[in-house]
């Protein structure tokens, strides 16, 4: 929280390129920060003719662009890769595109997930 103590945050984690990059595909990421450093959650995605392709989600290092954002809202007009970041546990579960230049707001809801079976 940037006030002398280390911050801990939990974010939704996802990596579309998980096989190549040798990571988990999805889950929860627990982020533990350094003293006086903030931590954020982020989401990134592509929009191919209205089809949303999730790229990455997870923890994002201290970044003033993410300060005090309760919701994950991308504001760039038409990037190849959309990006949003926010502060608050699991705030990257839902993400929105709201271009600064105006235009329709599009919110992406995560698909309902089946309960994980622990064996």
């Amino acid at each position: 929280s940037g006030r002398g103590e280390a911050e801990t945050r939990e974010c939704i984690y996802y990596n579309a390129n998980w096989e190549l990059e040798r990571t988990n595909q999805s889950g929860l990421e627990r982020c533990e920060g350094e003293q006086d450093k903030r931590l954020h959650c982020y989401a990134s995605w592509r929009n191919s003719s209205g089809t949303i392709e999730l790229v990455k989600k997870g923890c994002w290092l201290d970044d003033f662009n993410c300060y005090d954002r309760q919701e994950c809202v991308a504001t760039e007009e038409n990037p190849q890769v959309y990006f949003c970041c926010c502060e608050g546990n699991f705030c990257n579960e839902r993400f929105t595109h709201l271009p600064e230049a105006g235009g329709p707001e599009v919110t992406y809801e995560p698909p309902p997930t089946a309960p994980t079976l622990l064996t």
């Epitope: 390129n17 190549l20 990059e21 040798r22 990571t23 990421e29 982020c31 533990e32 931590l39 982020y42 990134s44 990455k56 997870g58 923890c59 994002w60 290092l61 970044d63 003033f64 662009n65 990037p79 190849q80 890769v81 959309y82 990006f83």
Partner: antibody, heavy 120, light 107 residues
Framework: QVQLVQSGAEVKKPGASVKVSCKAS????????ISWVRQAPGQGLEWMGW????????NYAQKLQGRVTMTTDTSTSTAYMELRSLRSDDTAVYYC?????????????WGQGTTVTVSS | DIQMTQSPSSVSASVGDRVTITCRAS??????LAWYQQKPGKAPKLLIY???SLQSGVPSRFSGSGSGTDFTLTISSLQPEDFATYYC?????????FGGGTKVEIK
């Protein structure tokens, strides 16, 4: 303070192997990744690969696949990079660097570099 | 692989000058971009991460901007210790790749 200390310079013959070490101190070794980057004389930086000391996961640059192995020893907080079948164009300064486990994964602390010379 | 192209490859400048270095990615990398400074015989040093976040301990005369494919490193008022080579690097997808470097020389 946080630092990475690398092993000393090496001179090797073509076809030989080299193993460079990188000892970490001042932070929790398993909370960060380690990347290896090399720089040939007068050239730019080339990323070689990455390892997670937490679980041993590795990711190597395609051009080095099959010749490079990255390992860690968590008991001594040391990372290792072994390069086999050395060629003259492997002559370079080899750096280890600490990598944040969180996006966008900058390399925030670097070792001093290890010069590897491959010459017959 | 994502190609990173830096320009110019070298720039001559004087103390106090404003210096701008650009980096272009061959495809969108959002904000997964870092800038490093390297002096002869030394290891690189992280200046900027996430395209615009200043690393702890780095002077505020360094700033980064950009997103997607086009990025900029600016030194607002060049100091004697800033003469060095600067590299951009993407970490959006493996293999991570660096730009070719920009050497900032004394005019």
């Amino acid at each position: 303070q946080v630092q990475l200390v690398q092993s000393g310079a090496e001179v090797k013959k073509p076809g030989a192997s080299v193993k460079v070490s990188c000892k970490a101190s001042g932070y929790t070794f398993t909370s960060y990744g380690i990347s290896w980057v090399r720089q040939a004389p007068g050239q730019g930086l080339e990323w070689m690969g990455w390892i997670s000391p937490y679980n041993g996961n590795t990711n190597y640059a395609q051009k080095l696949q099959g010749r490079v192995t990255m390992t860690t020893d968590t008991s001594t907080s040391t990372a290792y990079m072994e390069l086999r079948s050395l060629r003259s164009d492997d002559t370079a300064v080899y750096y280890c660097a600490r990598v944040s486990m969180y996006a966008p994964e900058p390399m925030d602390v670097w070792g001093q570099g290890t010069t590897v010379t491959v010459s017959s | 692989d994502i190609q990173m192209t830096q320009s110019p490859s070298s720039v001559s400048a004087s103390v106090g000058d404003r210096v701008t270095i650009t980096c272009r990615a061959s495809q969108g990398i959002s904000r997964w971009l870092a800038w490093y400074q390297q002096k002869p015989g030394k290891a690189p040093k992280l200046l900027i991460y996430a395209a615009s976040s200043l690393q702890s301990g780095v002077p505020s005369r360094f700033s980064g901007s950009g997103s997607g494919t086009d990025f900029t490193l600016t030194i607002s008022s060049l100091q004697p210790e800033d003469f060095a080579t600067y590299y951009c690097q993407q970490a959006f997808s493996h293999p991570w790749t660096f730009g070719g470097g920009t050497k900032v020389e004394i005019k």
